[in-house]
């Protein structure tokens, strides 16, 4: 899980420190998880497609009083510092399924690792 150095970056694209750091933070969260993450709080699942960073931020921001994910919230803000337009928000908020924060983090981590391997840093 922690061996990010093993990810191959295709072509001349330089590795993204921002994506790497986000992955490392999510790895830390999953590995250091003793009690249920954020007391088992539930968040809306998201489509791991275009607009994923903003959607992930919008979902995780609704978990209050959980210091374990505040750094993740702030790191996601780096990818999505300004609100997307009102029209784009409808696609971000497909609010039909709730999952535990721990599962959300694991799903996000797996997807980000895939993006990193493929060199999709933005």
């Amino acid at each position: 899980l922690t061996c990010l150095g093993g990810f191959a970056s295709p072509g001349p694209v330089p590795p993204s420190t921002a994506l790497r750091e986000l992955i490392e933070e999510l790895v830390n969260i999953t590995q250091n998880q003793k009690a249920p993450l954020c007391n088992g709080s539930m968040v809306w699942s998201i489509n791991l497609t275009a607009g994923m960073y903003c959607a992930a931020l919008e979902s995780l921001i609704n978990v209050s009083g959980c210091s374990a994910i505040e750094k993740t919230q702030r790191m996601l803000s780096g990818f999505c510092p300004h609100k997307v337009s009102a029209g784009q928000f409808s696609s971000l908020h497909v609010r039909d399924t709730k999952i535990e924060v721990a599962q959300f983090v694991k799903d996000l981590l797996l997807h980000l690792k895939k993006l990193f391997r493929e060199g999709q840093f933005n």
């Epitope: 993204s16 420190t17 921002a18 750091e21 986000l22 931020l57 919008e58 921001i61 609704n62 919230q73 702030r74 790191m75 996601l76 803000s77 780096g78 990818f79 999505c80 510092p81 300004h82 609100k83 840093f121 933005n122």
Partner: antibody
Framework: EVQLVESGGGLVQPGGSLRLSCAAS????????MSWVRQAPGKGLEWVAS???????YYPDSVKGRFTISRDNAKNSLYLQMNSLRAEDTAVYYC????????????WGRGTLVTVSS | DIQMTQSPSSLSASVGDRVTITCRAS??????????VHWYQQKPGKAPKLLIY???SLETGVPSRFSGSGSGTDFTLTISSLQPEDFATYYC?????????FGGGTKVEIK
């Protein structure tokens, strides 16, 4: 300790160009969005530009097409290229770490003064 | 653009006083239950400093005498007991809509 140090300000004639720089230290620069905010003499604050970690840029209409924000993560530096400068662009320009619409502008530099005058 | 109107524009107060500054947005700056308003302090010749984010969350390292409240269009920054180092200008800012906009500022002076 987080530090943001702006440079490149000075006197420029209307219609001229200037490039501001911001040197960042004390944090992982490439992992944060960044912004420029300006303050005309004796006036309030005005947001000028932002850039995400993925290099998406954002501008208000007042500078769109004239100003360009960019970053060089290898040099831990943020830039603002200002073209077609007007008298109303005269201000202290601050570089700020932008932690997004939920968290605000969390760290600021001391600013650099840009004066547009003939 | 969303206009942020602060009042008063200036006030005089003494050390130990309770100080309240208000900020009114021209339209709601609430977003899915969060109020996207932030408060900054600026001393003469210095850079602004973030005090409060998301209307009522205290930024790390900021003294607890500062607090924020409000939702929708009306927001308040309160200093429970004014200290000598609190004499400065305070700005509100909204991030609910581009362009991000600031209030005109409230200068807190020594009485």
């Amino acid at each position: 300790e987080v530090q943001l140090v702006e440079s490149g300000g000075g006197l420029v004639q209307p219609g001229g160009s200037l490039r501001l720089s911001c040197a960042a230290s004390g944090f992982t620069f490439s992992s944060y969005a960044m912004s420029w905010v300006r303050q005309a003499p004796g006036k309030g604050l005005e947001w000028v530009a932002s850039i995400s970690t993925g290099d998406t840029t954002y501008y208000p209409d007042s500078v769109k097409g004239r100003f360009t924000i960019s970053r060089d993560n290898a040099k831990n530096s943020l830039y603002l290229q200002m073209n077609s400068l007007r008298a109303e662009d005269t201000a202290v320009y601050y570089c700020a770490r932008n932690e997004g619409y939920y968290f605000g502008l969390t760290q600021w530099g001391r600013g650099t003064l840009v004066t547009v005058s003939s | 653009d969303i206009q942020m109107t602060q009042s008063p524009s200036s006030l005089s107060a003494s050390v130990g006083d309770r100080v309240t500054i208000t900020c009114r947005a021209s339209e709601s700056v609430d977003h899915f239950g969060w109020s996207l308003v932030h408060w900054y302090q600026q001393k003469p010749g210095k850079a602004p400093k973030l005090l409060i984010y998301r209307a009522d969350s205290l930024e790390t390292g900021v003294p607890s005498r500062f607090s924020g409240s409000g939702s929708g269009t009306d927001f308040t920054l309160t200093i429970s007991s004014l200290q000598p180092e609190d004499f400065a200008t305070y700005y509100c800012q909204q991030s609910n809509e581009d362009p991000w906009t600031f209030g005109g500022g409230t200068k807190v002076e020594i009485k």
